[in-house]
Amino acid sequence: IWELKKDVYVVELDWYPDAPGEMVVLTCDTPEEDGITWTLDQSSEVLGSGKTLTIQVKEFGDAGQYTCHKGGEVLSHSLLLLHKKEDGIWSTDILKDQKEPKNKTFLRCEAKNYSGRFTCWWLTTISTDLTFSVKSSRGSSDPQGVTCGAATLSAERVRGDNKEYEYSVECQEDSACPAAEESLPIEVMVDAVHKLKYENYTSSFFIRDIIKPDPPKNLQLKPLKNSRQVEVSWEYPDTWSTPHSYFSLTFCVQVQGKSKREKKDRVFTDKTSATVICRKNASISVRAQDRYYSSSWSEWASVPCS
Amino acid sequence: RNLPVATPDPGMFPCLHHSQNLLRAVSNMLQKARQTLEFYPCTSEEIDHEDITKDKTSTVEACLPLELTKNESCLNSRETSFITNGSCLASRKTSFMMALCLSSIYEDLKMYQVEFKTMNAKLLMDPKRQIFLDQNMLAVIDELMQALNFNSETVPQKSSLEEPDFYKTKIKLCILLHAFRIRAVTIDRVMSYLNAS
């Protein structure tokens, strides 16, 4: 058993049918010695008396808010949560496996640049009685500071019969140098509590591996005289690291017809312009990627040909 | 990524082309190592990230873009001195810091070159003959060093009398390649920045 926060405790259970469970001793936080009784949740049934209460925790029915009283007055509370270990593996019931980029990916994180700021998100089908708390650091043995905000519900989607809820959090490394070569990964730890179930999820990554630039901005077309060709130009996104000559991007320019089946013409360039043939009803899209370290491509920025 | 390779303009900063080739070569070698050594811990998540140049060179600090010198987090240690002549500085009025930067890059390359050559000698003795260093990568390191043209003491190739542990050697190869790729990215960024300056 360990303390998650004041008066909230997590009991770790080897989870299998007929398991013996864990013996837990609760102590009433009071100088009083006599006339103390214990109850669980809203029930008025007295579970025991005395300054300590010994219970055998086996299932969720044994978890909850234990309260010690004296003469109708509440003295203190202890909330017991359960953390299930199923055959050596901690349970992952609360969050959905996003399966990208690999199985057992519960947390996904992205950074728009090398400033040390990043966003993580996760999915669940649970709508109520759900709380998250996020901590992060650079490295684990001698951790350096990363500050995370509160997790917030960022999107709701309908998936078949189920509703899916997306939560996200923003974090910032306290003293980040954009040019630094990372040797210790960022660690992100999410504590999830649903009713009386506790779970924790972790992700470990280098900022360089989660970079996904914003799409190029100010995408413009300039027709070339007496030609079907156009000059496409764009700019680096505002959120990208500076100076751009050091943090350079490479670009992919695509001409796509109205029909998805039509052949796509693609050009790769390090410049912020390109000359392409603009077909009728086609659209021109441009996306960006770090020129030197191949992490994710940005989303496409698009303009119609007409 | 198979992108069309741009050929440098004649007036271009001479080392940019070589640094681009270096990054391409080390990335290809790392990809090959990860595929060939699939049953070894060779991915970024599995290896220990070691920097053989740590406390010996200070490329990131010495080559910091001017715009980032205001960022206190980038100014941890900038107290290294290196030789200040080199042909990449050709016909340019360069600051002491720029010379320091290129000299630091040269020292990095020299250290990695020695490590890779020593490692290749061990890998050639492996009866499995599973993996060797790409000669193209070694040649590209050499070309960039020549372009930088710093006079520096030659570091003797390490020779080891004991029987090599091939498993450990292959894991060390993965560690070296990951670290060298990261340094090659920094070198490329620096050359691009200097070229634009």
Epitope: Y16, P17, E59, K85, E86, G88, T92 | P41
Partner: antibody, heavy 115, light 112 residues
Framework: QVQLVQSGGGVVQPGRSLRLSCAAS????????MHWVRQAPGKGLEWVAF????????YYADSVKGRFTISRDNSKNTLYLQMKSLRAEDTAVYYC????????WGQGTMVTVSS | SYVLTQPPSVSGTPGQRVTISCSGG????????VKWYQQLPGTAPKLLIY???QRPSGVPDRFSGSKSGTSASLAITGVQAEDEADYYC????????????FGTGTKVTVLG
């Protein structure tokens, strides 16, 4: 104590279907994941499928994917394995088992696929 | 479909020490715990070892399990006639609680 009683085995022709049941008692069935494991005559144990405690996730061995469906009815304390397009190589003793460090096994039920 | 490799058979005389190896890889044994089962003819498998080296109550202490790197092993110190059975190791693939992977099985014969 924990008991798993299996039923539904038998002889079936290739291409036909069969549904196995596993009735659980002696524990809170709705709190635990369940597996099906099989053993062909004279061969080793082969994992077939797994279902989470609430039925939200199901996982299958490649050899049965698309043909077998694992399901559960927590109100009836019963686990099922629906087997379609049966093949001769599906001939085996099928066991249901609880998920956890200490697992409990059913008595097994024989499925014979033969023409 | 067997990801874990065991020797087909091992034998020993009563009182001898018998060991069975179980060889896997980074995706299973390295990253997950190992179990061992004993199966007597015509019966369901019985759990002998869980969590690499833990014995459920009721299992004699002559059975012990260990794990190192990509392999695990089961030792029977002072093998007895009633230990003649098939033995299987089991782990999970890639921390994925769903997919159990079993060993190929080892027949233990007690001579004499």
């Amino acid at each position: 104590q924990v008991q798993l009683v299996q039923s539904g085995g038998g002889v079936v022709q290739p291409g036909r279907s069969l549904r196995l049941s596993c009735a659980a008692s002696g524990f809170t069935f709705s709190s635990y994941g369940m597996h099906w494991v099989r053993q062909a005559p004279g061969k080793g144990l082969e994992w077939v499928a797994f279902i989470r405690y609430d039925g939200s996730n199901k996982y299958y061995a490649d050899s049965v994917k698309g043909r077998f469906t694992i399901s559960r009815d927590n109100s009836k304390n019963t686990l099922y394995l629906q087997m379609k397009s049966l093949r001769a190589e599906d001939t085996a003793v099928y066991y249901c088992t609880t998920h956890g460090s200490h697992d409990n096994w059913g008595q097994g039920t024989m499925v014979t696929v033969s023409s | 479909s067997y990801v874990l490799t065991q020797p087909p058979s091992v034998s020993g005389t009563p009182g001898q020490r018998v060991t069975i190896s179980c060889s896997g890889g980074r995706s299973n044994i390295v990253s997950n715990t190992v179990k061992w089962y004993q199966q007597l003819p015509g019966t369901a498998p019985k759990l002998l070892i869980y969590g690499n080296d833990q014995r459920p109550s009721g299992v004699p202490d002559r059975f012990s399990g260990s794990k190192s790197g990509t392999s695990a092993s089961l030792a029977i110190t002072g093998v007895q006639a009633e230990d003649e059975a098939d033995y299987y190791c089991q782990s999970y693939d890639r921390g994925f609680t769903g997919s159990r992977v079993f060993g190929t099985g080892t027949k233990v014969t007690v001579l004499g």
